[in-house]
């Protein structure tokens, strides 16, 4: 469960800042990329690389962005309507358990295992025994065998709120 | 782990409104990080987004169905509420309810509703 | 609205079979699509975000690429629980839009 946005994930807004632009709210929302002023007469739009949102909203400020944290590189920026995409590093991967942290990825199986799944920035290596095919789960044994993993694979996020 | 459950009757008679209740456990809708939506999904299998709410009442409704949609909350009882008006047979669908993943960098929708299926006959 | 156009509506494979799935947007979205997966009287599951990326817990026999308005899922080797319709869903603008279904049948 991603935590509660509290007041510190808004980003005020300056409403006199000259370079936001402004917009009239339709039926009292205010488009992506946009949050509503306080009188509810305006729409004003995020700070580009600072703050987001990415819906119709009446939200009085847009939400803060993500900054990626030192473990993981930013896939695509913070844009007015996008929060940030963070992912792991190479070699390295986000557990369901522990969203919190990139951990490294295996380097190879234990004995009478074999690999079957590359390290992924969402999943370690997968290991199953080479009799029954069963997925091996729990701690790796100190030791292993010389199959290694060979990091790679489509992008997959760090970070998964504002 | 969050988990969702419509409710509803499941026979609705033409040019009646169709009622429909969605039930969050496991996570608490005043959450600030989610949206929560209504999809419904034709006999033929096409999947039709039919609109959002926020945990703060704000809502956006499909400009399809925009006219006889009305969608609405009760944090108190961690429910969502979906209410068509006008009903016809061509709004006999498996209505679903999800979570829009929407305040982050991504919007998708997870998890689901096992779906509930509603009949518009007489 | 943008459309999502799916092919092809179905396709017969055999277990191990490397099958692709393509969704073309009607117009330009970047990257951001979505690839589900839906079994008969199921709800659809969450596959594949951002075009590329998989949800926690899917198989890396799944992949996902493309942006713009050109798409693919790819089945590496295809097992017997993926058979199943895959939808595709645009998040680029409201109002959210789904593909018309793919359906990945027995051989």
């Known amino acids: 469960e991603s935590a509660l946005i509290t007041q510190q994930d808004l980003a005020p807004q300056q409403r006199a800042a000259p370079q936001q632009k402004r917009s009239s709210p339709s039926e009292g929302l205010c488009p992506p990329g946009h949050h509503i002023s306080e009188d509810g007469r305006d729409c004003i739009s995020c700070k580009y690389g600072q703050d987001y949102s990415t819906h119709w909203n009446d939200l009085l400020f847009c939400l803060r962005c993500t900054r990626c944290d030192s473990g993981e590189v930013e896939l695509s920026p913070c844009t007015t309507t996008r929060n940030t995409v963070c992912q792991c590093e190479e070699g390295t991967f986000r557990e369901e358990d522990s969203p919190e942290m990139c951990r490294k990825c295996r380097t190879g199986c234990p004995r009478g295992m074999v690999k079957v799944g590359d390290c992924t920035p969402w999943s370690d290596i997968e290991c199953v025994h080479k009799e029954s095919g069963t997925k091996h789960s729990g701690e790796v044994p100190a030791v292993e065998e010389t199959v290694t993993s060979s990091p790679g694979t489509p992008a997959s996020p760090c970070s998964l709120s504002g | 782990q969050v988990q969702m459950q419509e409710s509803g009757p499941g026979l609705v008679k033409p040019s009646q409104t169709l009622s429909l209740t969605c039930t969050v456990s496991?996570?608490?809708?005043?959450?600030?990080?989610?949206?929560w939506s209504w999809i419904r999904q034709h006999p033929g299998k096409n999947l039709e987004w039919i609109g959002y709410?926020?945990?703060?009442?704000?809502?956006y409704y499909n400009p399809s169905l925009k006219s006889r949609v009305t969608i609405s909350v009760d944090t108190s009882k961690n429910q969502f509420s979906l209410k068509l008006s006008s009903v016809t047979a061509a709004d006999t669908a498996v209505y679903y309810c999800?979570?829009?993943?929407?305040?982050?960098?991504?919007?998708?929708?997870?998890?689901w509703g096992q779906g509930t299926l509603v009949t518009v006959s007489s | 609205d943008i459309q999502m156009t799916q092919s092809p509506s179905s396709v017969s494979a055999s277990v191990g079979d490397r099958v692709t799935i393509t969704c073309r947007a009607s117009?330009?979205?970047?990257?951001?699509l979505a690839w589900y997966q839906q079994k008969p009287g199921k709800a659809p599951k969450f596959l594949i975000f951002v075009a590329s990326s998989l949800q926690s817990g899917v198989p890396s026999r799944f992949s996902g690429s493309g942006s713009g308005t050109d798409f693919t899922l790819t089945i590496s080797s295809l097992q017997p629980e993926d058979f199943a319709t895959y939808y595709c869903?645009?998040?680029?603008?409201?109002?959210?839009?789904f593909g018309q279904g793919t359906k990945v049948e027995i051989k």
């Open positions: 117009q330009g979205i970047s990257s951001w």
């Open positions: 496991g996570g608490s809708i005043s959450s600030g990080d989610y949206y």
């Open positions: 709410i926020y945990y703060s009442g704000s809502t």
């Open positions: 999800a979570r829009d993943n929407g305040s982050g960098s991504y919007d998708w929708f997870d998890p």
């Open positions: 869903q645009q998040a680029n603008s409201f109002p959210r839009t």
